[in-house]
Every structure is written in C-alpha cells, then in structure tokens.
C-alpha cells in the first residue's frame, strides 16, 4: 500500500535557527521515510531536508539549518512520502519568510509610574536578541492586577530605532500593583513569539479614594447623651495598597454648625456622645496627597420614627457562599447596608458591615465566616439620608453537633412522675440552630424510653413511670448536624405521695 | 565560548579621570546590551552603568550620573566606562556583563574577570 | 529604587549540612529574582534565575522558591566548594539591585 499523501503541511521560521516544516499523517502504518523538497533564493536554489535515516523515520517534521536560510525569501515545499511499495507527493505549498517568521520574546526591563503622571506605568523593554534588526515589530501587551486572573490586553507596533522601547499604559487605577507581560511578531509574520517574563510595577499612589461610613446607635446612657460608634473603612473600589495617615471627623447638631466639634484620629473607629437631637457627621481620610472627598452620615433623633420597608428576608447557603435575600416594599429604596456579627455571650469582638446598592441580596463567601459560629445578620434600608428599621436574622454557615449537652436536673420526683428542667445550652458551645431536645429514660434494667421536644421546651414533665424505682436520665440536644448527650442523671420516683414534704421544701 | 575581558584599571588621585575597557568575544556584541557593576573592597555588588545593543540609550544610578559615561563601539567588540571626577567612593573592581537580555539565564549570566580601580591620594 | 535585604550576613555551617538564606524585596518583584554564587577572588556567577529556575551546569543540590517579596536559596547537602558569597538580585525593575550578600564559613 503506498503511503497516505502528506497533507496540513505547516512551516515556521525560527529566525536565525533553522525554517521547520510539519505535515499529516504524523505515524504511518508502515515504515514511511520523507523528502522535504525546497526552493529558495526565489527559486533560484533548491535543496532537500531528509528523514530516511533510522533515528528521523516515521517522523513528520523536517528542520532546514543555517547558513541556506536566506531572509527575505519566498520558499517552495514539497513533501514526498516513501515507503517499500512506493512514493507519494504533496501539493506543493508556497512560505513568504516573513509571513511565518517566529521571533524570541522581549524582556520587559523596567515598569515604573513617572514622577507627576497620575495611573499611568512606563513600560520599557528589550527587543529580542534574536529578530530583525530593521522590521517593525507589533507588540501583544498583557497586564492585570495583582490580585486579577484575568488579563487586559493592548496591542501596539514600534519601528526599530534601537533595543530601547518604551510603552506607556494610561488609565489604570491609582496605587495599584500591576503584572505585565509582551510579546512581539514581525509586522507580517502570523507567529508570535512567546509571552516575556511577568514583572510588576506599581501605578503612583493619589489622595485616598474615599471612604464608607457607618454607625452603631447604643442605648441613651442616664444623663440622656447617646454613644454612636462610628466607624469608616476604604470605600469600595478603592486601591488595595491606598493607605491613609489619619482621618478627620467634624459633626454638629442639625441647624446649627456653630456648635461643630472635630476629632482627629489614626483608628477607623471613634465614639461619639451625642445629645437628643439630629446630628451630621463628616470624615474624610487624608494621607501626604491630599484628602479623600467627604463621607456623610445623619444620626437621627432620639424620638424619631424610623421607616420600616423590609417584609422578609431568607438566608440559604450554595456550595461556597451564604446568601441573603429580603422583600422590600418601597421600590425607591435601592442602598442598604448589612451587619454582620458573631452571636456570643460577651460583646462580639469582631462587627462587619458592607453597603449594598442596586440590589436585594448580599453574598458572602463561607469560608469569610467560622463554621460552627452562629451570625447575626441585620439589613438597614437606607433611602438619601435616612435610615430604616433593620430587619435581623440569624445563620450558620456550618453546623455541627454541640460541644455539650444540656445540662439537667429532675425536680418534683413523684410517685409515677418527675419534671426534668434543663438549661439552654450556651451559644459558644450550640454549633448550629438547636433544632429539638431528646430526653432519655431507663428503668434500672428495663428498656430506654425517649421523648422529642421543641427547642423552645426546657422542661418536660414524664408520667407512666414506676414507683420506687430507680431510673437514668439524660437529656440530648440536636443540631442538623446531630446530637450531643448531657450528663446522666439519676433519681428515684417515691413509694408513696409526700404532700407534707413539698411544703416543707417549698418553705 | 562568551569572554570579557576588562582593562584599564589602576590607582588614580581623587578629582581625576580614568577609561576601563572590557573586550567582547564568542557572541554577537553588537546584539546585546552591557552593563558595568562594580565592588568595593569587601563590599556588595553595585550596578553601575548599562548600554543599549545600538549605543543609543544609557542608563546610571544618581551615584555615578554626570560622572560617568558608559559606551561601546561595536565594530571592534568593546565596551568602555570613561570615569571623571573620580572619589575616594569609587574604589571598587569594576565588572563588565553582558545584560540585561532576553535570553534565558538570568540578566547577567557572564561576567569579565573584574579590574580594580583604587581612587587614593 | 526596590531595596533587597538579605539575611543572614553570614553563616557556620559544616560540609554536608542543609543551608537555607532569605532575601526579602522592599516592593512586590513577582519571581524576578537571580541568585549569584562569588567565590574568594572570583567573579560571580548565577545559581539560580526567575526566582526557581536553575542555570546551565549547576548541580540540583543548589535551589531557590518564592514570589512577590520573600525569596528563598537553598543548598541541600552543603559542599567545601561551596563556600562563598551568596547574593540576591531582583530583576524586575531597573536598576538592578543586589542583597546585601550572604557569607558562608567553615565552622
């Protein structure tokens, strides 16, 4: 059989390395050796590039060295493919050098902001070793954020003045870290080289961005001021590296600046004491550059009605996030702002808020949140300058068993009866939403009876026992993710009814 | 097989002037860029000046900027550092590379054997 | 300019032991990072380019890892040739700037 015809044939030009031509089928069935049959000078030479030596056969690709690659050139390229019962010949194809001429990449030398020119890097680079002294080269320019996966792209072509290229990239953010990468091609060639090594420059840092600005309202104290913790953070959309020397604040009572106060602070948190009446508070932030524009926050009234719009609100978990959605009914409100905290006994030690616009969900990733922990969740309808009502709910973003049981013990034991209290368990060692209480019982050698409550139930009263026995009880809280026992506990139901002794025991 | 060789060191008065040169071989000069590092006595690498492959381009650090000037003439394979004004600071050996450059290996993967200059009165 | 500071200055170590230095860049330099080796009287040489990758005829017992701003050299199984001069190099950004050099001795 002879062999298939040599199709698909590609040639590429590695500049000052060898012209290499591939084509199908790349294994024959039999042993195929090959002629790579070649013109060149424009057609003036020719020459062949052979594959019939053991190392080289079955082999579908052929590599022309220096010094008979002449540049420019137009090429000619058969290819014929032999085994023992004959020969076959492709079409012949035609290669224009430049056209398929593959390059090294550049090396990107320097990334530097310039003194003065705002979100702007400087690229320089250096024109690969191994190129053209006198073609124009076109330029692939890569760059993304540090913290990106995802790249941008600019394309651009330099004539070749000398190995020093410079590039200037506008429009970035400011203090922003940046991953750059080039690559180059002839102007006519349809090879790119390889992309360069990334490096990293840094856009020039400006006047912080701006800043968000929250608050938390606590109880009026006994001489009727109110502490309102107020806190800020860089808005979103910021730079990550922006950082800031200090913050002012100033803030007075509604219709009356004559009486502003100003604060100066390094934290990103500060307690006021205010009086009874509206406020308006300002804080900008500021570093060597100048300040950030203006964050405004109104502290209403002490009597004053706050509007309520939210009607529900649900929080479900995907695979990777907690999400939480609400009902509004005022179509016009479209920013709120959630609270995120720890429900624990002691005051939480870490408080999250996140303003939300255009929207009626908030996301966040489980693994921002402690499993096991449970989150209290509040949303605050904010319309201009006003702030509604917060709606609350609670979550976990992993349940798991309790770390303890219940702790329990059997009061007014009876004949036949006994009333078994139990203490909720504390919300450190919950582990999820206690979703019932099993209380089990065993008769001293008898079977083990059970009983399923509520989680709002911490008191059971069990009936049908028997006299003068001795019974083991414990008290199982569960979780969706199972049960934990409390400690066993032991009594004994009486013989016969004691009034007198109640009321004994009462007094 | 790449070679550099520098020359052109010596003991020289502070104030005065002195030119190193650095001889190319086994590669093509005229493709690449070089630099000039120095090292003082018992002291840590230092770069010093740096050359575009064509000559057209020159970059300094502000330590030697003004008094320093790095070139190269590609004919004969030679790259120069001529020294003015020359300070008891500039006492170092200075190396020739050749670098920065896109080929694999680092910036600068060969280095001459290093002439010493010593600025002393 | 990006400030390389390499630790330690100097370091007893006996023929066979695990050599580790640190090299730590005063601003993000992604992996672009060179090792040189100087011997007494030598020019130097390089180890070790692009944070990681390992130059032509040096042998594997010579390593080196990081990104961003901390960087790493290692020599697994310390020889007496070895002693000398280590120092980092970033190459990100012009100019060039070289660690401070890290000096291993006999102990």
């Known amino acids: 059989v002879l062999p298939a015809k040599p199709e698909n044939i590609s040639c590429i030009f590695y500049y000052e390395e060898n012209f290499t031509c591939t084509w199908s089928p790349e294994k024959e069935a039999s042993y195929t050796w090959y002629k790579v049959k070649r013109t060149y000078s424009y057609g003036y030479k020719s020459d062949i590039c052979s594959t019939d030596n053991s190392t080289r056969g079955n082999h579908a690709s052929c590599s022309f060295l220096p010094p008979t690659i002449t540049n420019p050139d137009n090429y000619t390229i058969q290819v014929e493919a032999q085994n023992a019962d004959g020969i076959m010949k492709s079409d012949i194809t035609y290669w224009n050098l430049d056209a398929i001429m593959k390059i090294e990449p550049p090396e990107i030398f320097s990334v530097k902001s310039v003194l003065g020119i705002k979100r702007m890097l400087q690229i320089k680079w250096i024109r690969p070793v191994l190129a053209p002294h006198s073609s124009t080269l076109k330029y692939t320019l890569r760059f993304r954020t540090i913290n990106s996966a995802y790249w941008m792209e600019v394309n651009f072509t330099k004539e070749d003045i000398d190995r020093d290229e410079t590039y200037n990239l506008t429009e970035l953010q400011a203090f922003t870290e940046y991953v750059m990468t080039l690559r180059c091609a002839p102007a006519e060639s349809m090879f790119w080289s390889g992309w360069s090594q990334e490096k990293v420059g840094t856009t020039e840092e400006e006047a912080p961005y701006g800043l968000d600005l929250w608050r938390v309202l606590k109880p009026a104290m006994v001489d009727g001021r109110r502490p309102v913790q107020l806190m800020w953070k860089k808005a979103t959309g910021a730079p990550v590296l922006e950082k800031a020397l200090g913050y002012n604040i100033w803030y007075f009572p509604e219709n009356n600046t004559n009486l502003t106060e100003t604060v100066n602070t390094t934290n990103q948190t500060h307690e006021l004491y205010l009086g009874g009446k509206t406020y308006w508070v300002y804080v900008v932030s500021y570093n060597s550059l100048g300040e950030s524009p203006v964050a405004t926050l109104r502290i209403p009234a002490l009597n004053e009605k706050t509007f309520q719009c939210i009607e529900a609100m649900q929080a479900c978990l995907t695979q990777d996030q907690l999400v939480v959605e609400w009902q509004s009914s005022a179509p016009e409100v479209d920013t709120w702002m959630v609270e995120w905290f720890p429900d624990v006994d002691s005051e939480p030690s870490s408080f999250s808020w996140e303003s939300v616009s255009q929207a009626r969900n908030w996301t966040i990733q489980k693994d921002e949140l402690k499993p096991l922990w449970c989150y209290n969740i509040s949303v605050y309808p904010v319309l201009r300058d006003r702030v509604g009502q917060p709606y609350s709910t609670q979550a976990y973003v992993q349940e798991g068993i309790p770390s303890a049981g219940p702790v329990t013990q059997a009061d007014s034991i009876g004949v036949k009866t006994v009333t078994i209290t139990w203490k909720e368990i504390p919300k450190s060692k919950r582990n999820g939403f206690i979703k019932n209480y099993t209380i089990f019982y065993q008769a001293e050698d008898g079977k083990e009876f059970s009983k399923t409550v509520n989680s709002n139930i911490l008191q059971y009263r069990l009936e049908s026992l028997t006299r003068r026995t001795s019974y083991s009880l414990q008290v199982m809280a569960s979780t969706n993710a199972g049960g934990t026992n409390g400690t066993k506990i032991n009594f004994k139901t009486l013989s016969i009814s004691h009034h007198h002794h109640h009321h004994h025991h009462h007094h | 097989e790449v070679q550099l060789v520098e020359s052109g060191g010596g003991l020289v008065q502070p104030g005065r002037s002195l030119k190193l040169s650095c001889v190319a071989s086994?590669?093509?000069?005229?493709?690449?860029?070089m630099t000039w590092i120095r090292q003082a006595p018992g002291k840590g690498l230092e770069w010093v000046a740096s050359?575009?492959?064509?000559?057209?381009?020159?970059y300094y650090p502000d330590s030697v900027k003004g008094r320093f000037t790095i070139s190269r003439d590609n004919a004969k394979s030679t790259l120069y550092l001529q020294m003015n004004s020359l300070r008891s600071e500039d006492t170092a050996t200075y190396y020739c590379t050749r670098g920065p450059t896109t080929v694999v290996g680092g910036w600068f993967a060969y280095w001459g054997q290093g002439t010493l200059v010593t600025v002393s009165s | 300019d990006i400030v390389m500071t390499q630790s330690p200055t100097s370091m007893s170590i006996s023929v066979g032991d695990r050599v580790t230095m640190n090299c730590k860049a005063s601003q993000n330099v992604g992996s672009n990072v060179d090792w040189y080796q100087q011997k007494t009287g030598q020019s130097p040489k390089v180890l070790i380019y692009r944070a990681s990758s390992r130059s032509t005829g040096v042998p594997d017992r010579f390593t080196g890892s990081g990104s961003g701003t901390d960087f790493t050299f290692t020599i697994s199984n310390m020889q007496a040739e070895d002693l000398a001069v280590y120092y980092c190099m970033q190459s990100n950004s012009y100019p060039p700037t070289f660690g401070g050099g890290t000096k291993l001795e006999l102990k």
């Open positions: 086994g590669f093509t000069f005229n493709n690449y860029w």
């Open positions: 050359i575009t492959n064509t000559g057209g381009t020159t």
